[in-house]
Amino acid sequence: FERTRSLQDPCSNCPAGTFCDNNRNQICSPCPPNSFSSAGGQRTCDICRQCKGVFRTRKECSSTSNAECDCTPGFHCLGAGCSMCEQDCKQGQELTKKGCKDCCFGTFNDQKRGICRPWTNCSLDGKSVLVNGTKERDVVCGPSPADLSPGASSVTPPAPAREPGHSPQ
């Protein structure tokens, strides 16, 4: 089948890094500078992605693979293939449409990206709180209260604030 296809379509012989040049009797021509073809049999080469502005180059473009970008310090990637760079916040904060905001009581964010999340409610998983939560850290759950030796106490954090005015937006 492969041999038959090759006889019918000379372009199928063109390897990655080349394209089938219709202007030159369908011979395999190397991709021009700043372009690539990642698969064989291509009739054109794709333009390399350029990592400009807040994007920086993580991997240079080659004749067979596109460039890969990441973000400059103070920003992080969003989306497949780092399609966007988004501003970092501090741990204990989240980025809202109005900028970085501290996590409300009862929520945490242990990263520079993403949202403030509610502390884990250990009791719902049949466990007790070993370490209280903070704006930067989730609570640490331990063994179930029944597993604790007599006289041992567990710390239970107050329920997360749920007033509409305090919920992270």
């Epitope: 989306g79 509610p118 409610n121 989730d138 937006q169």
Partner: antibody, heavy 120, light 106 residues
């Protein structure tokens, strides 16, 4: 490539429990929160909760608190959802879904779904 | 708890533009995600963070979000776009889905 493969269909009696598994491959399991979402026949999507595969921390929808437990086994790159005290209205397709990178919890990859039928 | 309202159904002729709305109190301050679900299949993310498209999703799919309404717009609608569409937001401590909209291609 990235894949979430769920366990097979289950038939349960009212009052019983069911435990559905979701095996992840093709990405760093501990790097992304895992959510569970269910869909009753002919109905919409209903969020149940999440697990942080790194820490084991959880968050559950109020409706399911006390009946659902979401856990994970990092060595097996697998998340589990256990629902207890089943009733007929729990008959649904249960999906695991990986949280993506957007600012406000998008679910960018989904398992194929597991049908749980509750019938006496 | 936060609620999202979608029209149960929207009909559109092939080649035309479909607009599916998602209403919620001050939804413009939140990030909205949209999913497409075809019969017997798992949902697929088609728009995230109001208006961004995951790789592999056609440019015909776009989104907007302001005030009390988010909108998923599908231009040059094709028969293969016929599906249920769900909006979704994060609110305080839970993930919230809209009721879903069935898109029918006439």
């Amino acid at each position: 490539q990235m894949q979430l493969v769920q366990s097979g269909a289950e038939v349960k009696k009212p009052g019983a429990s069911v435990k559905v598994s979701c095996k992840a491959s093709g990405y760093s399991f501990t790097g992304y929160y895992m959510h569970w979402v269910r869909q009753a026949p002919g109905q919409g999507l209903e969020w149940m909760g999440w697990v942080n595969p790194k820490s084991g921390g959880t968050n559950y929808a109020q409706k399911f608190q006390g009946r659902v437990t979401i856990t994970r086994d990092t060595s097996a790159s697998t998340a589990y959802m256990e629902l207890s005290s089943l009733r007929s209205e729990d008959t649904a397709v249960y999906y695991c879904a990986r949280e993506g990178w957007a600012r406000r919890i998008d679910l960018d990859e989904w398992g194929q779904g597991t049908l749980v039928t509750v019938s006496s | 708890s936060y609620e999202l309202t979608q029209p149960p159904s929207v009909s559109v002729a092939p080649g035309k533009t479909a607009r599916i709305t998602c209403g919620g109190n001050n939804i413009g301050s939140k990030s909205v995600h949209w999913y497409q679900q075809k019969p017997g299949q798992a949902p697929v993310l088609v728009i995230y963070y109001d208006s961004d498209r995951p790789s592999g999703i056609p440019e015909r799919f776009s989104g907007s979000n302001s005030g009390n309404t988010a909108t998923l717009t599908i231009s040059r609608v094709e028969a293969g776009d016929e599906a249920d569409y769900y909006c979704q937001v994060w609110d305080s401590s839970s993930v919230v889905f809209g009721g879903g909209t069935q898109l029918t291609v006439l």
